[in-house]
Interface confidence: low
């Protein structure tokens, strides 16, 4: 899986987990979220060759296509496939408010 | 939707459905497939700005860092949706087999 | 057949801007990256950035600040802003197309093709 | 940044002589084959000879050939022509670089 147990310990070009840590205030002006300041979102990004972990048939072909048709601009993406949520603290007048956001975190990446 | 009906009929330099025609023969290499000669399969590409048909609340976050912080790296990128399967004919010897091969053709993009 | 022409070159003092003008034809800047490489009287070539099929701009560390790049796609065009000339700036400009976009941040073929005839930038008092 | 070192910077040959050109970078390129070769013409832009370290532009004679991995490649003209007086230039691309590009000093080919 092109997770951080594989990606943070190795150097690779190809598809894969980068880390990203995103302030809250400085990186996205988000003021209203008081705890955490922030959190480690990470991204993905790297290369797609072929058969380089593929998410459907298309990226598959469309990898394939890119290899013997170098020039073309048509080519796979490195996205996030796992994510998982954030636990925050807000407020609402003076009413402290914790909340779940979806998708926040991306743990592993994959070619689409 | 970021699909043919859409992206087909505007100049549009955001993330969007790309035509792309692949042959089989020519553009893979594949000599098993019969029929068809080759198919639409089509493609996904473009810039992913802050709310561009974005995926997940990670592709918001992603994009708005990328919008204050435009030197990073960390950016979503255009990705498919809705993929379609390709009924294709061919032989195992000279016995003629039909197959759908799952998600094959792109039908609308996103950004993830 | 898939072409670009460059425009806007000319003689400017030292301090000064100008905008270049790379027209393309025979392919959609939607979906290929465009460069502008320059080149110096009787020098090398010098890559300088380029704009991708999605809008993001790249730039050289050198030429980072002092220059933009940006493109109308409507228009077919795509522009290099160039702020506080120096006489070093002196240099043919070129416009050249990536053979391959991909949608990875991390690297191209470094295969530009086709490239525009080039334009005369001039910075002299 | 990475830099692109090519030798010798000029050379005198004659028609039928086997020519051969160094690249050397400073750097590892992308992919490790994400180097080309250009030859250019008095007033005239570069013209794109080889790509992906070997792989021969539609157009270009066969008589050009490009080999080399990682940060040493090699250009090689098996029999030189009259129209082949030029200077040719390395082009690479790279991966986590400021600098997604560099060019070579160049290599002046002239006739002896």
């Known amino acids: 899986a092109l997770d951080a147990a594989y990606c943070f310990r190795n150097v690779q070009d190809n598809c894969c987990l980068r880390p990203l840590y995103i302030d809250f205030k400085r990186d996205l002006g988000w003021k209203w979220i008081h705890e955490p300041k922030g959190y480690n979102a990470n991204f993905c990004a790297g290369a797609c060759p072929y058969l380089w972990s593929s998410d459907t048939q298309h990226s598959r072909v469309l990898s394939l296509y890119n290899t013997i048709n170098p020039e073309a601009s048509a080519s796979p993406c490195c996205v996030s496939q796992d994510l998982e949520p954030l636990t925050i603290l807000y407020y609402i007048g003076k009413t402290p408010k914790i909340e779940q956001l979806s998708n926040m975190i991306v743990k592993s990446c994959k070619c689409s | 939707a970021l699909d043919a009906a859409y992206c087909f009929r505007n100049v549009q330099d955001n993330c969007c459905l790309r035509p792309l025609y692949i042959d089989f023969k020519r553009d893979l290499g594949w000599k098993w497939i019969h029929e068809p000669k080759g198919y639409n399969a089509n493609f996904c590409a473009g810039a992913c700005p802050y709310l561009w048909s974005s995926d997940t609340q990670h592709s918001r976050v992603l994009s708005l860092y990328n919008t204050i912080n435009p030197e990073a790296s960390a950016s979503p990128c255009c990705v498919s949706q809705d993929l379609e399967p390709l009924t294709i004919l061919y032989y195992i010897g000279k016995t003629p087999k039909i197959e759908q091969l799952s998600n094959m053709i792109v039908k609308s993009c996103k950004c993830s | 057949e898939q072409q670009l022409v460059e425009s806007g070159g000319g003689l400017v003092q030292p301090g000064g801007s100008l905008r270049l003008s790379c027209a393309v034809s025979?392919?959609?800047?939607?979906?290929?990256?465009v460069n502008w490489v320059r080149q110096a009287p009787g020098k090398g070539l010098e890559w300088i950035g380029y704009?991708?099929?999605?809008?993001?701009?790249y730039y050289a560390s050198w030429a980072n600040g002092r220059f933009t790049i940006s493109k109308d796609s409507a228009k077919n065009s795509v522009y290099l802003q160039m702020n506080s000339l120096r006489a070093e700036d002196t240099a043919v400009y070129f416009c050249?197309?990536?053979?391959?976009?991909?949608?990875?941040?991390?690297?191209?073929?470094?295969?530009?093709?086709?490239w525009g005839p080039g334009t005369l930038v001039t910075v002299s008092s | 940044d990475a830099q692109l070192t090519q030798s010798p910077s000029s050379l005198s040959a004659s028609v039928g002589d086997r020519v051969t050109i160094t690249c050397q970078s400073s750097?590892?390129?992308?992919?490790?084959?994400?180097l080309s070769w250009f030859q250019q013409k008095p007033g005239k832009p570069p013209k794109l000879l080889i790509y992906?370290?070997?792989t021969l532009t539609s157009g270009v004679p066969s008589r050009f050939s490009g080999s080399g991995s990682g940060t040493d490649f090699t250009l090689t003209i098996s029999s030189l022509q009259p129209e082949d007086f030029a200077t040719y230039y390395c082009a690479g691309g790279y991966s986590g670089s400021s600098d997604k590009y560099a060019f070579g000093g160049g290599t002046k080919v002239e006739i002896k």
């Open positions: 050249a197309r990536h053979m391959q976009v991909g949608g990875a941040p991390t690297g191209s073929m470094a295969a530009f093709d086709p």
């Open positions: 992906g370290a070997s």
């Open positions: 025979g392919f959609s800047l939607s979906s290929y990256t």
């Open positions: 704009i991708s099929y999605g809008g993001s701009a």
């Open positions: 750097q590892s390129v992308y992919n490790n084959n994400y």
